[in-house]
Interface confidence: medium
């Protein structure tokens, strides 16, 4: 495939990445799948600058990001190292809370209404943000 040089329609460019902000809600897995079908991934926050950009666009609304611990340790969906990377959890989070009564703990991370992160039940229907890098090869065939 060819390298993407500009963002798709309705996506927003920032620092060589393209972002798409949903206005409806889905469970984390459905949001993850939606982004993959768009040749993208749920947003991976690697800096405070990127955090500010994303939260400026989402406003004070719970919104999924590409961070989960469904298999044990916290992992970013694109393989970015969690331990050494940027973090912005709310105080006392993540807490893998079991008291919600929905079964299990909390395995998926989202932006809260002040921008900082919380872990929550992955089935909750939150908005989401997709991200794709401009410099990566597109899955579309090259134009001849």
């Amino acid at each position: 495939g060819s390298e993407r040089t500009c963002c798709p329609v309705n996506w927003v460019e920032h620092e060589r990445s393209c972002y798409w902000f949903s206005r409806s809600g889905k469970a984390w897995a459905d949001a993850d799948n939606y982004c993959r079908l768009e040749d993208a991934h749920l947003v991976v926050v690697t800096s405070w600058e990127e955090q500010k950009f994303v939260q400026h666009h989402i406003g004070p609304v719970n919104t999924w990001m590409g961070l989960h611990d469904q298999n044990g340790p916290w992992k970013w969906v694109d393989g970015t190292d969690y331990e050494t990377g940027f973090k912005n959890w709310r105080p006392e989070q993540p807490d893998d809370w079991y008291g919600h009564g929905l079964g299990g703990g909390e395995d998926c991370a989202h932006f809260t209404d002040d921008g900082r992160w919380n872990d929550d039940v992955c089935q909750r229907p939150y908005r989401w943000v997709c991200e794709t890098e401009l410099d990566k090869a597109s899955q579309e065939p090259p134009l001849l």
Partner: antibody, heavy 126, light 111 residues
Framework: QVQLQQSGPGLVKPSQTLSLTCAIS??????????WNWIRQSPSRGLEWLGR?????????DYAVSVKSRITFNPDTSKNQFSLRLNSVTPEDTAVYYC????????????????WGRGTLVTVSS | QSVLTQPPSVSGAPGQRVTISCTGS?????????VHWYQQLPGTAPKLLIY???NRPSGVPDRFSGSKSGTSASLAITGLQAEDEADYYC???????????FGTGTKVTVL
């Protein structure tokens, strides 16, 4: 003009509870773009953030790790004020206590204190 | 105690330029969180001097300027004046503490 007016006793006995109140004029304790903080200052610890209370569709409290087990904030919308309770005080808690506002909006999410109360010297001594 | 480190004191003659450093770590300044500066005159509450690394609130003279690089920040005072004699504190946010952190404070003396 926004002002923060602090009140509370200046002397507290060891093991008792320190209680301070900060009355807000010209702004709202339940503002969606502000948070209301307590900060203390002593020669031994310097400036130390104790925590904050703020409203974003519901009330939140953030507490500093160093005092988390002993501290409680209580916002009062009817009086437009917020209070601090610090339990089981020791002489180490002797300090000037300030209330302060931090501003936060989505276009400009910098966290800083743009407004301070005048401070209350609290001495912990028997 | 304080997470951000500043020199205890700096001094300069009137008209000179002095700088105050503020050193943090990868979970505060190094993570990209903005640095803010406060001036505290004797017997008064701290007053916001610089916010967002380099922005001055209205009413603050342009003799005061701030900058940030890596895990540290600095405050510069040019054309030092007698009324600048005060304590200066840096402040940021720390993601590992999920809270605000202050510098150790620097006393500026005008000779």
């Amino acid at each position: 003009q926004v002002q923060l007016q602090q009140s509370g006793p200046g002397l507290v006995k060891p093991s008792q509870t320190l209680s301070l109140t900060c009355a807000i004029s010209g702004d709202s304790v339940s503002s969606n773009s502000a948070a209301w903080n307590w900060i203390r200052q002593s020669p031994s610890r310097g400036l130390e953030w104790l925590g904050r209370t703020y409203y974003r569709s519901k009330w939140y409290n953030d507490y500093a790790v160093s005092v988390k087990s002993r501290i409680t904030f209580n916002p009062d919308t009817s009086k437009n004020q917020f209070s601090l309770r610090l339990n089981s005080v020791t002489p180490e808690d002797t300090a000037v206590y300030y209330c302060a506002r931090d501003r936060y909006n989505w276009n400009y999410p910098y966290w800083y204190f743009d407004l301070w109360g005048r401070g209350t010297l609290v001495t912990v001594s028997s | 105690q304080s997470v951000l480190t500043q020199p205890p004191s700096v001094s300069g003659a009137p008209g000179q330029r002095v700088t105050i450093s503020c050193t943090g770590s990868s979970s505060n300044i190094g993570a990209g969180f903005e640095v803010h500066w406060y001036q505290q005159l004797p017997g008064t509450a701290p007053k916001l001097l610089i916010y967002g690394n380099s922005n001055r609130p209205s009413g603050v003279p342009d003799r005061f300027s701030g900058s940030k690089s890596g895990t540290s920040a600095s405050l510069a005072i040019t054309g030092l004046q007698a009324e600048d004699e005060a304590d200066y504190y840096c402040q940021s946010y720390d993601s590992s503490l999920s809270g605000y952190v202050f510098g150790t404070g620097t006393k500026v003396t005008v000779l």
